[in-house]
Structure formats: C-alpha cells, structure tokens
Interface confidence: medium
C-alpha cells in the first residue's frame, strides 16, 4: 500500500556537542517493522542510518556517523521512528532526508538541522 512520509516542518536546532532527535513517520500509520527505514544526507545520499531486515545496519553508515546515531523504534509498529544523533558537530548542519521503503514503494521527507555554538554570545549594550 502507499503512504506519505512526514517529518518536522521547521528546522530543528541543536547545540554543538549535544544530542538531537529527528522524528519521522508514515501516514496513514502502519507497522513499519518489516520496512527499510533510513536517513541520508542529500544530494548524493550518504547513509546516516539504515534499518533493514529488522535490524540496524551499522556497518553501512558513512564513517562520520558511525557510533553517533541511534534509531528509536518504540513506535515503529505505528510507523513512527526517531533518529537520535549524539555529539552534534557543525558539519551536521543542513539537510537530512528520512525514507521508508516497503518492497518497491519508497517515500521520503526532507528536514533541516541547524547547529549552534553553545559558547557564542553577544555582550549586552
């Protein structure tokens, strides 16, 4: 069956060194346990995180994301997942795309991450 993929409409903000969560879901909601689910960076789609065959495919990640991501799957039965990125870097700023693939059918949603410096401040006056 067909579905839409929905991600956050507004940019998500994170501080360098912090964790950030990027939510993504399918509509209408359905069990995505058997689907391929992942995140990549446009334009040429380096793998940020890939879930396939019922498990996370850690070995397929781009080296800069290895060990820094976790797919939160508590609600995958309802078609909802969240990508957690740890130790956010400035290089993480920009576009991410989340996708769900069910056999031959694939849909995706783009989202944006803004990364800020926790030590940047403007003196008053």
């Amino acid at each position: 069956g067909q579905f839409r993929v929905i991600g956050p409409r507004h940019p998500i903000r994170a501080l360098v060194g912090d964790e950030v969560e990027l939510p993504c879901r399918i509509s209408p909601g359905k069990n995505a346990t058997g689907m391929e689910v992942g995140w990549y960076r446009p334009p040429f789609s380096r793998v940020v995180h890939l879930y396939r065959n019922g498990k996370d495919q850690d070995g397929d990640q781009a080296p800069e994301y290895r060990g820094r991501t976790e797919l939160l799957k508590d609600a995958i039965g309802e078609g909802k997942v969240t990508l957690r990125i740890r130790n956010v870097r400035f290089s993480d700023e920009g576009g991410f795309t989340c996708f769900f693939r069910d056999h031959s059918y694939q849909e995706e949603a783009a989202m944006e991450l803004k990364v800020e410096d926790p030590f940047y401040w403007v003196s008053p006056g």
Epitope: G38, Y40, P42, P43, F44, S45, R46, V47, L50, R52, N53, Q57, D58, G59, D60, Q61, A62, P63, R66, T97, F99, R101, H103, S104, Y105, Q106, E108
Partner: antibody, heavy 118, light 108 residues
C-alpha cells in the same frame, strides 16, 4: 579521489558463471550502495542490483534467480556472479556507486565486456 | 516496473544549436528521483542531472533539466562539439531502478 576499477573473465560459454570484481580505491565502502549495471552492445542500460558494506543486497527481479553479489570489506571490493549465462547476457558490465536515497550513479568503473559464445 | 521512453531516438543537430530531449515515464515519477546521464563511445556513463533539475558537480550550465509527473526534459542550450553523445534518463521512484532507451545526439 575515489575510483572504481573492475576486472573479470571476458569470454564465457553458455551455462557458465560470469564473475566480476570491482575495487574501490581512495574511499570507503561505507555510506553508499555499490551497484552493477550492464549494457548489451548498441543497447541501453540495465540495473542488475547492488550491495552495501554489510552485505545487504537489492536485485533486479528480472535477474534475481541467477545473481549473487558479495562484498569483501578487508579488500574494499565487491563482486558479481551471474550463473547459467546465455548469449543474451553478452554486454558491457559496469560497477558503480549510488546513494541510498536519490539512487543516482555518481561514480562508475571503466566497464568490462563479457561475451557469451559457444 | 516503470518504463522510461526517450524520444527522439536520434537527434541530428549542428554545434551551437539547442537540443531538447524527452523522457516519458509509464507512471508518475517524483521529480526528486529522475536523473540524466551522458555516455560517449567506449566510456562509462557520466551523471549530468539529478533530482530532475540539479546539475552534478562540474557539469556546465548549458545543460538543464525540467519536468514533473510523467514528462521530463533535458535541454542543452548551445551544443558544443563534446556534447555529441548518447543521453539516458533514469528513475528511482519505484523499484527496480530503470533507465530509458537513450537518445543519440549526432552531428548534422
């Protein structure tokens, strides 16, 4: 700069197994899908399938029953086996790199002409 | 599977002329999932356009892509001698990944 270099037998008899290998130089297998595409003489391109660093595969249903792909991460190589070949499998075979989402082929090997003839 | 039909099969033009190549899909393709490649004799294809309209790195701005749904177009605004080649479209909207049959742009 990442480069793909491929090799394998160029002349086969019907019913034999085609075997090709592609090496990735200057980069990692991680983060991309690694594909095989073929082109019969004077004809268009056909996607055969692809494999990831961890060995997950996608195959074209039209060839799935005869195709096996494998990866050797220690050598930064991936391979294609196509069994029970016929003259219809005569083609230039290319290895290529594609992204997971956009699925465009942004890097290609030089191609290997494989001829099947009795 | 999605069938991509390219037309014309051959386009005979002179350097400096404008080339318009068509790619028609058997069912709707998201514009994010349509790419164009150039192939010269004895060489591997080279990515020109991805996402229907974005030029790949190093591709001159005389190449442009457009379209949506089932109809996509590659335009070469002014043909240079090195542009005479075969051009293929490719989709990833549905699996398996498929290519069009190609359009040969030849010197008139």
């Amino acid at each position: 700069q990442v480069q793909l270099q491929q090799w394998g037998a160029g002349l086969l008899k019907p019913s034999e197994t085609l075997s090709l290998t592609c090496a990735v130089y200057g980069g990692s297998l991680s983060g991309y899908y690694w594909s095989w595409i073929r082109q019969p003489p004077g004809k268009g391109l056909e996607w055969i399938g692809d494999i990831t660093h961890s060995g997950s595969t996608n195959y074209n249903p039209s060839l799935k029953s005869r195709v096996t792909m494998s990866v050797d991460t220690s050598k930064n190589q991936f391979s294609l086996n196509l069994n029970s070949v016929t003259a219809a499998d005569t083609a230039v075979y290319y290895c290529a790199r594609r992204g997971i989402g956009a699925a465009v082929f942004d890097l290609w090997g030089q191609g290997t002409l494989v001829t099947v003839s009795s | 599977e999605i069938v991509l039909t390219q037309s014309p099969a051959t386009l005979s033009l002179s350097p400096g002329e404008r080339a318009t190549l068509s790619c028609r899909a058997s069912q709707s393709v998201s514009s994010s999932y349509l790419a164009w490649y150039q192939q010269k004799p004895g060489q591997a294809p080279r990515l020109l356009i991805y996402g229907a309209s974005s030029r790949a790195t190093g591709i001159p701005d005389r190449f442009s892509g457009s379209g949506s749904g089932t109809d996509f177009t590659l335009t070469i605004s002014r043909l240079e001698p090195e542009d005479f080649a075969v051009y293929y479209c490719q989709q990833r909207s549905n699996w398996p990944l498929t290519f069009g049959g190609g359009t040969k742009v030849e010197i008139k």
